[in-house]
């Protein structure tokens, strides 16, 4: 195989651009989801976000986030998720294990799942971008 070592493949400005794009798309998704009135956030769902034992951007739980967003896509046809998934795939190693998500079957519970995960995803991308930029600052000092 002629694949170069991973560290040679992707300049940090690309990673930052990917995460910035994800952050922007996460806000679009949340805005769309929040238009549904009378839905409350649930404590039953937690989106894995950053891993403390890895360096950015590998500290982002991209495969798990992808699986959660794929579940939202199945429950509610939000086209912005297609673009989110394409960008997450830029951060996911091709041999990363699959994550299985149990899909809520009740309509109201589905709406709570969508709102909760969308909110957590938006917060996660804010954190991811912060971790990237602070990591970049540490690398230059």
């Amino acid at each position: 195989s002629h694949t170069l070592p991973v560290r040679l493949l992707r300049p940090s400005d690309d990673v930052q651009k990917i995460v910035e794009e994800l952050q922007s798309l996460s806000k679009m998704l949340l805005k769309d989801v929040e238009e549904e009135k009378g839905v409350l956030v649930s404590q039953n769902y937690t989106l894995p976000c950053l891993s403390p034992d890895a360096q950015p951007p590998n500290n982002i739980h991209s495969p798990a986030i992808r699986a959660y967003l794929k579940t939202i896509r199945q429950l509610d046809n939000k086209s912005v998720i297609d673009e989110i998934i394409e960008h997450l795939d830029k951060l996911i190693f091709q041999d990363a294990p699959e994550t299985n998500i149990s899909v809520p079957t009740d309509t109201h519970e589905s709406k709570r799942f969508i709102l909760t995960i969308s909110q957590q995803f938006s917060e996660c991308m804010d954190l991811a971008l912060k971790s990237l930029t602070s990591g970049a600052q540490q690398a230059t000092t």
Epitope: S1, T3, L9, I18, E86, D89, F93, Q94
Partner: antibody
Framework: QVQLVQSGAEVKKPGSSVKVSCKAS????????MQWVRQAPGQGLEWMGA????????RYSQKFKGRVTITADKSTSTAYMELSSLRSEDTAVYYC???????????????WGQGTTVTVSS | AIQMTQSPSSLSASVGDRVTITCRAS??????LAWYQQKPGKVPKLLIY???TSASGVPSRFSGSRSGTDYTLTISSLQPEDVATYYC?????????FGGGTKVEIK
């Protein structure tokens, strides 16, 4: 080494459909996007769509939406591209292509099928 | 959709000449750009991926570079076997559009 083998040439009548297959071998990755591209005689390359076979997730060019369907059979490592309501302008060579690299997203298509010529004529 | 504007559409150069082909993306696509070579009647062949990484077995006279949203394929010393049409393709977000192609001929 990845190999992509496509189905043979087809001659079709206007208004009919064609289904082209692309069988992949020699790879172990599960997370990848495979694309379909066509090239009309004397013309450039035109992106038609892509599939993420692990989930059957698809993306289509707006130009072909509603006329093209891309599917994959994981058990046989075969992808399919079906184009319906054929017209003479669909006469082209159709290619499938497959990426290499450490990420699920592509940044170049390293492997290409040999191409399938589809002729649409009454 | 992201547009890829490729120029020139054709060029004629002498053996040994330095040849440059440019693709301009309608928005920032990072390094998510590939270059292909297609000889008449043949399958496209990947030359450069990730804007500037050479694919396996590609002669060193082919190189890729990027400046903002402008991407350049350079053939440092044109050879007779380089007669072909060259295409760029972006992979930022679908649709993964191609440039219109550049036909390279020998003078």
């Amino acid at each position: 080494q990845v190999q992509l083998v496509q189905s043979g040439a087809e001659v079709k009548k206007p208004g009919s459909s064609v289904k082209v297959s692309c069988k992949a071998s020699g790879y172990t990755r599960t997370r990848y996007w495979m694309q379909w591209v066509r090239q009309a005689p004397g013309q450039g390359l035109e992106w038609m769509g892509a599939i993420y076979p692990a989930e059957g997730d698809t993306r289509y060019s707006q130009k072909f939406k509603g006329r093209v369907t891309i599917t994959a059979d994981k058990s046989t490592s075969t992808a399919y591209m079906e184009l319906s309501s054929l017209r003479s302008e669909d006469t082209a060579v159709y290619y499938c292509a497959f990426p290499e690299g450490p990420y699920a997203a592509p940044y170049g298509m390293h492997y290409w099928g040999q191409g399938t010529t589809v002729t649409v004529s009454s | 959709a992201i547009q890829m504007t490729q120029s020139p559409s054709s060029l004629s150069a002498s053996v040994g000449d330095r040849v440059t082909i440019t693709c301009r993306a309608s928005r920032n696509i990072g390094n998510y750009l590939a270059w292909y070579q297609q000889k008449p009647g043949k399958v496209p062949k990947l030359l450069i991926y990730y804007a500037k990484t050479s694919a396996s077995g590609v002669p060193s006279r082919f190189s890729g570079s990027r400046s903002g949203t402008d991407y350049t394929l350079t053939i440092s010393s044109l050879q007779p076997e380089d007669v072909a049409t060259y295409y760029c393709q972006h992979f930022w977000s679908t649709p993964w559009t191609f440039g219109g192609g550049t036909k390279v001929e020998i003078k």
